[in-house]
Interface confidence: low
Amino acid sequence: FERTRSLQDPCSNCPAGTFCDNNRNQICSPCPPNSFSSAGGQRTCDICRQCKGVFRTRKECSSTSNAECDCTPGFHCLGAGCSMCEQDCKQGQELTKKGCKDCCFGTFNDQKRGICRPWTNCSLDGKSVLVNGTKERDVVCGPSPADLSPGASSVTPPAPAREPGHSPQ
């Protein structure tokens, strides 16, 4: 029965960019301005997203696809489809309710977003601090003092920085 009904449903013939207009004998009408339908057979068109305030238009709305927003300079996207914009901070800072604040001693943030994280504790791995940490950079761990005897292998270079956007939020 479902299959028979769908075959007879005139709305199923309405393509994306149109809607099945019940007020006009179920004929396919184009989506009105500032609305869209991304799939066929829809009985209504969805209102286009408006990018306003801190949001900028990255892609205009069309009859078949919604607008896409990104954030104005000084802010970055959060959430699916850039549903929120969050203020950037400088490296060495984190965002708090009172705006961007410097990382406390013993913590760092090497990105414009995210939170300050504790410096690596080199001694947990039996290593020593080769380069001191800063608000912007983690410490660099070197070999333990015992490894620094003549003939010991050279210091392993630090791992490459993490990809942007992968710090815990």
């Epitope: 801190v54 914009c85 965002l95």
Partner: nanobody
Framework: EVQLVESGGGLVKPGGSLRLSCAAS????????MSWFRQAPGKGLEWVSY????????DYADSVKGRFTISRDNAKNSLYLQMNSLRAEDTAVYYC???????????????WGQGTLVTVSS
């Protein structure tokens, strides 16, 4: 639908005053922190001030502290920004925004007004 409409902007001389208003609708106004932001010509957006839902928690950017006063009237669903001792560097489009996060500058996409222009010039 959330709607925020700013008004009260205009041209004012340095040292002058303006009062901005933001009329809110489509949500329970008293439940939300509200903020003012501004964007000077060719610059990024800057947070100006916020106020908690009940009005008991308030903070200001250092650049406006002592000159600007944020307030709200929950009975009228309105947010205000009283701006005194205005300077040329206060020239900007001012936006009110509903905050859905405890972090300044993190706001839901729809919760912004269209802005009102404040020009401070002699």
């Amino acid at each position: 639908e959330v709607q925020l409409v700013e008004s009260g902007g205009g041209l004012v001389k340095p040292g002058g005053s303006l009062r901005l208003s933001c009329a809110a609708s489509g949500f329970t106004f008293s439940d939300y922190y509200m903020s003012w932001f501004r964007q000077a010509p060719g610059k990024g957006l800057e947070w100006v001030s916020y106020i908690s839902g009940s009005g008991d928690i308030i903070d200001y950017a250092d650049s406006v502290k002592g000159r600007f006063t944020i307030s709200r009237d929950n009975a009228k669903n309105s947010l205000y920004l009283q701006m005194n001792s205005l300077r040329a560097e206060d020239t900007a489009v001012y936006y009110c925004a509903r905050e859905d996060s405890r972090l300044t500058g993190t706001t839901d996409f729809d919760n912004w007004g269209q802005g009102t222009l404040v020009t401070v010039s002699s």
